[in-house]
Interface confidence: medium
Amino acid sequence: QFLKEGQLAAGTCEIVTLDRDSSQPRRTIARQTVKCSCFPGQIAGTTRARPACVDARIIKTKQWCDMLPCLEGEGCDLLINRSGWTCTQPGGRIKTTTVS
């Protein structure tokens, strides 16, 4: 299977842009755009804190924790109105991700 330049193999993802804003103390805001070429019924998402192709039904229902977006050992919770999710580390530190 030969791919054109810039074309992704099915089932694969790449990070297109990654911007970091560390202007606020003790808080880093990262904005990431991911491009994926997914199998049928899948869509770009996040699994185990990495870009991945996920079940499209998860995106439709906004049940973000169903992507398993957090690292092993963390806990996942939906944000209010399903705008994203939080990953809580064993030490209590919380990483919040919003979807746009």
Partner: antibody
Framework: QSLEESGGRLVTPGTPLTLTCTAS????????MGWVRQAPGEGLEWIGI?????STYYASWAKGRFTISKTSTTVDLKMTSLTTEDTATYFC???????????????????WGQGTLVTVSS | ELDMTQTPPSLSASVGETVRIRCLAS??????ISWYQQKPGKPPTLLIY???NLESGVPPRFSGSGSGTDYTLTIGGVQAEDAATYYC??????????FGAGTNVEIK
């Protein structure tokens, strides 16, 4: 990290039964969980899965008769209209997603309980 | 309904031989296959996931290959402790996921 099934026993046909899988050492909010059964001397048979959110999917033969639900630390398998064909060891398994280098995502049943025996006999 | 045809049902091998177990899916499962080893009276343990990824802690003599509908588990240089039943689990979506019937491996 461990899983332990309980609730298996001898029941008569038609009796409902609920099996419980208790998870220790990890958060159920960050994994899928599945149930698998194995009749004596036979192979493994997939029953169904529960997502982190509580969404469920079942094997076609299990729909309607088997129900999977969960709390923060346990996963239940509720079985109704049991027949002698349902005699088996029932396993719960943790289902993680392994992500490859480029975003390939695959499920891994990476942690299993020891199983609980359900015997259906008149 | 997905069907996973696993062959052979049983085999006998001598220590050091290479053993191959095949699973054929009734439809393309996009490498959505994992392989498990089960010993009598014990739960299964994961060997390979995503067709070819070796689970951590599993000896490198175990390997997986294949794509589309055709997948193989290979044990290169089989050892006495590899005597067990091996199962493939295939499926592309959770509403259609199935175990193969199993292969019983006996070591002579």
């Amino acid at each position: 990290q461990s899983l332990e099934e309980s609730g298996g026993r001898l029941v008569t046909p038609g009796t409902p039964l609920t099996l419980t899988c208790t998870a220790s050492g990890f958060s159920l909010s960050n994994y899928y969980m599945g149930w698998v059964r194995q009749a004596p001397g036979e192979g493994l048979e997939w029953i169904g899965i529960i997502y982190a959110s509580g969404s469920t999917y079942y094997a076609s033969w299990a729909k309607g008769r088997f129900t999977i639900s969960k709390t923060s630390t346990t996963v239940d398998l509720k079985m109704t209209s049991l027949t002698t064909e349902d005699t088996a060891t029932y396993f719960c398994a943790r289902i993680d997603i392994g992500v490859g280098d480029y975003g390939w995502a695959y499920d891994r049943l990476d942690l299993w309980g020891q199983g609980t025996l359900v015997t259906v006999s008149s | 309904e997905l069907d996973m045809t696993q062959t052979p049902p049983s085999l006998s091998a001598s220590v050091g031989e290479t053993v191959r177990i095949r699973c054929l899916a009734s439809e393309d499962i996009y490498s959505g296959i994992s392989w498990y080893q089960q010993k009598p009276g014990k739960p299964p343990t994961l060997l390979i996931y995503g067709a070819s990824n070796l689970e951590s802690g599993v000896p490198p003599r175990f390997s997986g290959s294949g794509s589309g509908t055709d997948y193989t588990l290979t044990i290169g240089g089989v050892q006495a402790e590899d005597a067990a039943t091996y199962y493939c689990l295939g499926g592309y979506s959770y509403s259609s996921i199935t175990f193969g019937a199993g292969t019983n491996v006996e070591i002579k």
